[in-house]
């Protein structure tokens, strides 16, 4: 049994880091493998992660962490029984994938303005809380070409757009994702999408 693709890990910079790797053949990850991880700190102890299958030869492990600070470094040991398959390290602050925003809501009752709001996925005491920026994706269910991205570079988790920038009488969907420039993170996953029917009063044509 050998590791074909070494573990790569990303952290949500809160409580979970996810590591993925591939073995050289079909593997029952949860029964055959264990990923041991330990914070490099005098008084820390090793924790065991039981991996799950992620495709035939792929494995994924969710490492539970109390919290994360920029200085944290973890040692990782991948074991198959008594055999050490791989040894490495992981610094969560250098591999951050933020949590996805939640509670995306479209408010359509504001005079011909669409107000989209969502929730910051982090509590106020987390470093990323004040460092997230967002991308909002809006698309038409009827027209695949009607697909747009709005970059929200301010901290407030909301976006206002004129309803008239979208077609009237059509159903639209929206979703939002986040990233943090300070840690050069990857984008989060998209939030679940929300659907609304876009209708607004056409302005009278001036002749």
């Amino acid at each position: 049994m050998k590791v074909l693709q070494e573990p790569t890990c990303v952290s949500d910079y809160m409580s979970i880091s996810t590591c993925e790797w591939k073995m050289n053949g079909p593997t029952n990850c949860s029964t055959e493998l264990r990923l041991l991880y330990q914070l490099v700190f005098l008084l820390s102890e090793a924790h065991t992660c039981i991996p799950e299958n992620n495709g035939g030869a792929g494995c994924v492990c969710h490492l539970l962490m109390d919290d994360v600070v920029s200085a944290d470094n973890y040692t990782l040991d991948l074991w198959a029984g008594q055999q050490l398959l791989w040894k490495g390290s992981f610094k969560p602050s250098e591999h951050v994938k933020p949590r996805a925003p939640g509670n995306l809501t479209v408010h359509t009752n504001v005079s011909d303005t669409l107000l989209l709001t969502w929730s910051n996925p982090y509590p106020p005491d987390n470093y990323l809380y004040n460092h997230l920026t967002y991308a909002v994706n809006i698309w038409s269910e009827n027209d695949p070409a009607d697909f747009r991205i709005y970059n929200v570079t301010y901290l407030e988790p909301s976006l206002r757009i004129a309803a008239s920038t979208l077609k009237s009488g059509i159903s639209y969907r929206a979703r939002v994702r986040a990233w943090a420039q300070c840690y050069n993170t990857t984008w989060s996953e998209w939030s679940p999408s929300t659907k609304w029917h876009n209708s607004y009063r056409e302005p009278f044509e001036q002749h």
Partner: antibody, heavy 116, light 110 residues
Amino acid sequence: EVQLLESGGGLVQPGGSLRLSCAASGFTFSRHAMAWVRQAPGKGLEWVSAITSSGRSIYYADSVKGRFTISRDNSKNTLYLQMNSLRAEDTAVYYCARVHRAFDYWGQGTLVTVSS
Amino acid sequence: QSVLTQPPSASGTPGQRVTISCSGSPLFPDSGSFNWYQQLPGTAPKLLIYADSHRPSGVPDRFSGSKSGTSASLAISGLRSEDEADYYCGTWDYSLSGYVLGGGTKLTVL
């Protein structure tokens, strides 16, 4: 709410023994390393000893090595410090502290006086 | 003799910004993170800053920490009378397998 309550302090003669206890509540005791820190009257803080969450690893300051023993009972949520061969310079308020990278919660302390 | 050196005293007037330094000896390893504790008169110490610059919840943002090599600094802005206390820096010393604390700095608010 995290609470740490030390007990067992008192007056003891040089060469004597004392056992300090620290009752923990408000958090999962078995998941945290713990430590003892002391403060002699009018002096600064001095780290004494620390123990990992399971008790597998233990560390002591040179000044108490061989005389003090730290231990814990996770089933009772209690930290202990057994102090033997006590000296006058061990006179101090002894604080129990929870460890999360630093000493993030402290008890109110118990006074140990070593005097004849 | 502490491995971490702090000035024995510091002072400032209300509203001022004061800084307290904490210096490791030349041979002191610079890999560890610094922590800061506040001890108000007659009370137990309280964690103020951990991992160089992180504030536990409940600690006002007037308190900030920074690290440079083997030294660290605690800054208190908008000084208040209730900040009058002893301040200690500390770090885990892996070569000693233990925790080292500075001698403490007594802060007086004039």
